[in-house]
């Protein structure tokens, strides 16, 4: 906390600019009016105040605006937004796109700090879903955005919008998250012929419930082995050789390699062993001839 | 030569059931895996249920905890239990004997269920 002084005679501030840089803390405060700060935040960013000084400028905002910054303010803090708490942040009305992207480039290049997470929780809960602009805006700064969100915070993701999502932004989702996404992506997406359409919900098929699978698999699709290991198990397990023969295509040939990962692993266990020679691939594991699963309660389970 | 012939399908209200059979001829049953699909009008074919030759069964989203899939090795026949069924379940039904890169399509029944 800075002591009220008064402004040495001459140094009273007409206009934020670079002699500034030169007063003293207590000089700061007693020389800079609050307003004349609000009005002219756009300058500060241009002048290398020290972080002592940018924390007594800070000091005069939150004074002069104790229930939280206007957005006319917010929108030209620049690095001041570094100093910002995410107490000071939750007092604030974010709705514009423009102050988003503008506190966003401040932080660009460094992980999702807390103030920023907060500021992007105000933003959309403002907002009321995660709309396709703010999603583009969103996943440009920070690809995994996506993926850090609850199921609970993706069912607010309107299916307009998974078009702005790109296959690196679901690298680190998890499947409960994909379960959410992947019907929003088939009905963004269902329009689209066969080709086009599995080029833009592949990235999504983690979360692909058997059905979809199985009608994929008559479209000659040809997934590559890392998608197919994506893959839910307990979707892949009703899959016959066949069908996943039809799904992976040339790619076919990869499933000897992942014999022992899943969901390979455990689609080979409930494999009659010679519909897997059929393949020619040398897979091993299947349910030998003659041999049949009599114990339902625990496969019910399973499926 | 193989043959796939489906019946028990029927006009019925929402809330009904109906059992499908379907009986095989010309195969060894036994290692052979059942399905059934449906195809809704101006729909694409979808699956529905498949009893696995080694004794798995498993159900699509929609149709868990209201249809079951059966089998009678004896009787090379595979059955589908629709019980609750819904206007949404219309369509005609077919089932499929699957064996390796093997398959084998009957020619359906119709099933209406009217709201």
């Known amino acids: 906390e800075v002591e009220k002084t008064a402004c040495p005679s001459g140094k009273k501030a007409r206009e934020i600019d670079e002699s500034l840089i030169f007063y003293k803390k207590w000089e700061l405060e007693a020389c800079v009016d609050a307003a004349l700060l609000a009005t002219q935040m756009d300058r500060v960013n241009a002048i290398p105040f020290t972080y002592e000084q940018l924390d007594v400028l800070k000091h005069k905002l939150d004074e002069l605006y104790p229930q939280g910054y206007p957005e006319s303010v917010i929108q030209h803090l620049g690095y001041l937004f570094l100093k910002m708490s995410p107490e000071d942040i939750r007092k604030w009305n974010v709705t514009s796109l423009e102050t988003l992207k503008a506190l966003l480039e401040v932080n660009k290049g460094h992980e999702m700090s807390p103030q920023v997470a907060t500021l992007i929780d105000r933003f959309v809960k403002g907002r009321g879903q995660l709309d396709k602009d703010t999603l583009d805006t969103l996943t440009a700064f920070y690809p995994g955005y996506l993926c850090s969100l609850s199921p609970e915070e993706l069912s607010s993701v309107p299916p307009s919008s998974i078009w702005a999502v790109r296959p690196q932004d679901l690298d680190t989702c998890d499947p409960r998250q994909l379960d959410v996404l992947y019907p929003k992506a088939r009905l963004a997406f269902q329009n689209m012929n066969g080709s086009e359409y599995f080029v833009k919900i592949q990235s999504f098929l983690g979360g692909a419930p058997t059905e979809d699978l199985k009608a994929l698999s008559q479209q000659n699709v040809s997934m590559d082995l890392a998608t197919f290991m994506k893959l839910r198990t307990d979707a892949v397990l009703p899959l016959t050789v066949a069908e996943v023969q039809k799904l992976l295509g040339p790619h076919v040939e990869g499933l000897k390699a992942e014999e022992r990962h899943r969901p390979v692993r455990d689609w080979i266990l409930r494999q009659r062993q010679d519909d897997l020679d059929t393949l020619g691939l040398g897979l091993q594991g299947g349910i030998p001839n003659g041999y049949l699963v009599l114990d339902l309660s625990m496969q019910e389970a399973l499926s | 030569q193989v043959q796939l012939v489906e019946s028990g399908g029927g006009l019925v209200q929402t809330g009904g059931s109906l059992r499908l059979s379907c009986a095989a001829s010309?195969?060894?049953?036994?290692?052979?895996?059942m399905e059934w699909f449906r195809q809704a009008p101006g729909k694409q074919r979808e699956w529905v249920a498949s009893?696995?030759?080694?004794?798995?069964?498993y159900y699509r989203d929609s149709v868990k905890g209201r249809f079951t899939i059966s089998r009678d090795n004896a009787k090379s026949t595979v059955y589908l239990q629709m019980n609750s069924l819904k206007p949404e379940d219309t369509a005609i039904y077919y089932c499929?004997?699957?064996?390796?890169?093997?398959?084998?399509w009957g020619q359906g029944t119709q099933v209406t269920v009217s709201s």
């Open positions: 499929k004997a699957n064996r390796g890169s093997y398959e084998y």
């Open positions: 010309g195969l060894t049953f036994g290692v052979y895996g």
């Open positions: 009893h696995t030759s080694t004794g798995y069964v």
